[in-house]
């Protein structure tokens, strides 16, 4: 068990052109929240899938009000760490998503507004108990700087928080085969639960349920002493017939240490001394490289051949972010002015304007619209000092509260009769005409002009226009 800790250092405009406007305005202050989601392994799961390792939310950030005319600075951050407790072993490799949310404060139509300012994601290798790792991620024009670490909760220790530590029973040394718990030198590593019956004096285990023998002992439970009187070598697996040690491989034979690590034998097994940038029992854990496949969504990884050199993901069209983890969010360019809420609908951008503003990008300041709302999706537009609504299809009236008569525009051609219907309008065509709006003449021989009448409808039947 342990805790993943995230410290946000700064959130603000990234370097280069296209600096974002401040997310808050003088008229409408706001504050930020950060949300972190963790998943085990180098997961390719969608951002919306459950946070299997855990999730956490920051405290509320301080209220921030933009200074008119000033560039967007780094924004005031919530106090404290984001902490994600984990109950089981730390997986070593994990995926993270960090979201920055904005809460607009103050009275406004439709209630308080929440919006996602930025979402960054990545995949990392991290050993528990190690130092803080620093990171910078960009989302659109925003830049997030943060540090993170995983630490074990006592009595757990180790790079996966699977080893247990207990206070020493004797003041000077730990029990047979047990190491001091660095950095807690006054504690000793507690034995794992080995195979039932495994000799506590002559056996040990590195994985639960196994039983490995110290030198001089053999058998499934390490209870059989090995005779060395007529042996050539002082180590090796026991011969089934003589009980004598025959030459066998030592724990460092073949060098189990990866990535250039050097091996040294210990009374229990072996120990690897790892080169810079690697860690783990066999120096198998390193910084993320292109070999780890850090680029999502078909991104091309370049560089990063070794842990000390950075990799770069070249993203395919439609994706962005340090790891191509983010669909291009056109809202990140903040196209909606005057505090409008941006919605990326896929096929189009939509700006939901605050009261007092209108236009496709909320660019029109409508003092006469302030505090007024147009119902049913209508838009308030400037009307020479008077409040006027441009109503969505099917609605009319000063505030778009009245259902418009769909027949008012006389949509039925060639003398067809129009009937209002709950789903639109219906045209009853005059003899000799057909179609949704009676636009097609029926030929004298009974064949209609294109398009043909749908099955089951005779020419001249009323046709519903949806």
């Amino acid at each position: 068990a342990g805790v993943f800790e995230l410290q946000i250092h700064s959130f603000g405009p990234g370097p280069g052109p296209g600096a974002p406007r401040s997310p808050c305005s003088a008229r409408l202050p706001c504050r930020l929240f950060f949300r972190v989601c963790l998943k085990p392994g180098l997961s390719e799961e969608a951002a919306e899938s459950p946070c299997a390792l855990g999730a956490a939310l920051s405290a509320r950030g301080p209220v921030y009000t933009e200074q008119p005319g000033a560039p967007a600075p780094d924004l005031p951050l919530p106090d404290g760490l984001l902490q994600v407790p984990f109950r089981d072993a730390w997986p070593g490799t994990f995926s993270f998503i960090i979201e920055t949310w904005r809460e607009e404060l103050g009275d406004q139509i439709g209630g308080p507004a929440w919006s996602l300012l930025a979402r960054v994601a990545g995949r990392r290798r991290l050993a528990a108990g190690g130092p803080w790792a620093r990171d910078i991620q960009r989302a659109g024009a925003w830049e997030l700087r943060f540090s993170y670490r995983a630490r074990c909760e006592p009595p757990a220790v180790g790079t996966a928080c699977t080893r247990l530590c207990r206070p020493r029973s004797a003041p000077s040394r730990c029990g047979p085969g047990l190491r001091p718990c660095a950095p807690l030198e006054d504690e000793c590593e507690a034995p794992l639960v080995c195979r039932a019956g495994c000799s506590p004096e002559h056996g040990f285990c590195e994985q639960p349920g196994e039983c490995r023998c110290l030198e001089g002992w053999t058998g499934p439970l390490c209870t059989v002493p090995v005779s060395t009187s007529s042996c050539l070598s002082p180590r090796g697996p026991s011969s089934a017939t003589t009980g004598c040690l025959v030459p066998g491989p030592g724990p460092c034979d073949g060098n189990p240490c990866a990535n250039g690590g050097s091996c040294s034998e210990t009374p229990r097994s072996f120990e690897c001394t790892c080169p810079r940038g690697f860690y783990g029992l066999r120096c198998e854990v390193s910084g993320v490289t292109c070999a780890d496949g850090p680029c999502f969504n078909g991104g091309l990884c370049v560089g990063g051949a070794d842990p000390d050199s950075a990799y770069i993901c070249h993203c395919p069209p439609g994706f962005q972010g340090s790891n191509c983890e983010k669909r291009v969010d056109r809202c990140s360019l903040q196209p909606c002015r005057n505090g409008g809420l941006c919605l990326d609908l896929g096929h189009a951008l939509r700006c939901r304007c605050r009261a007092g503003f209108a236009g496709p990008r909320c660019e029109h300041d409508l003092d006469d619209c302030a505090g007024r709302a147009c119902a049913n999706g209508g838009t308030c537009v400037e009307g020479g000092g008077a409040h006027r609504c441009s109503c969505a299809l099917g609605f009319g009236g000063r505030d778009c509260r009245e259902r418009a008569d769909p027949c008012a525009a006389r949509p039925c051609a060639h003398g067809g009769r129009c009937y209002a219907h709950f789903s639109g309008l219906v045209c009853a065509c005059a003899p000799g005409y057909m179609g949704a709006r009676c636009e097609f003449p029926v030929h004298p021989d009974g064949a209609s002009a294109l398009p043909a009448a749908p099955p089951g409808l005779r020419p001249g039947d009323p046709q519903r226009y949806l």
Epitope: E48, A55, W101, Q108, G111, P112, L341, R352
Partner: nanobody, 125 residues
């Protein structure tokens, strides 16, 4: 997709209480916002109370502040609306709604994509 089923509506005298429940199923992990809305006959649908599911933040319409409380049980994927001090003007069809989008006005029904079928609340004087 997210499926929402409301329950707990009914008839009550003015000053009484009701507790509405909204059980969510489907891709509930993607719903950032859940709330209660109501529509009285001949009136527009209006926001009553909403919460940010992962932040324990709430918003209430002025007309219900101090009387209604929205809460959730994450383990059961259920959102509740405790309604105390009910008034005849609270009579309406109450709908549960959810939004998975990343920009929401908490009491604006136009920003919520998923809706239940509704449960009727009638308050008599």
């Amino acid at each position: 997709q997210v499926r929402l089923v409301e329950s707990g509506g009914g008839s009550v005298q003015a000053g009484g209480s009701l507790r509405l429940s909204c059980a969510a199923s489907g891709s509930t992990y993607s719903t950032n916002f859940m709330g209660w809305f109501r529509q009285a006959p001949g009136k527009e649908r209006e926001g009553v109370a909403t919460l940010v599911t992962w932040a324990e933040r709430t918003a209430y319409a002025d007309s219900v502040k101090g009387r209604f409380t929205i809460s959730q049980d994450r383990a059961k994927n259920t959102v509740y609306l405790q309604m105390n001090g009910l008034k005849p003007e609270d009579t309406a069809m109450y709908y549960c709604a959810a939004a998975a989008s990343t920009a929401v006005r908490l009491l604006d029904p136009g920003d919520f994509a998923y809706w239940g079928q509704g449960t009727q609340v009638t308050v008599s004087s």
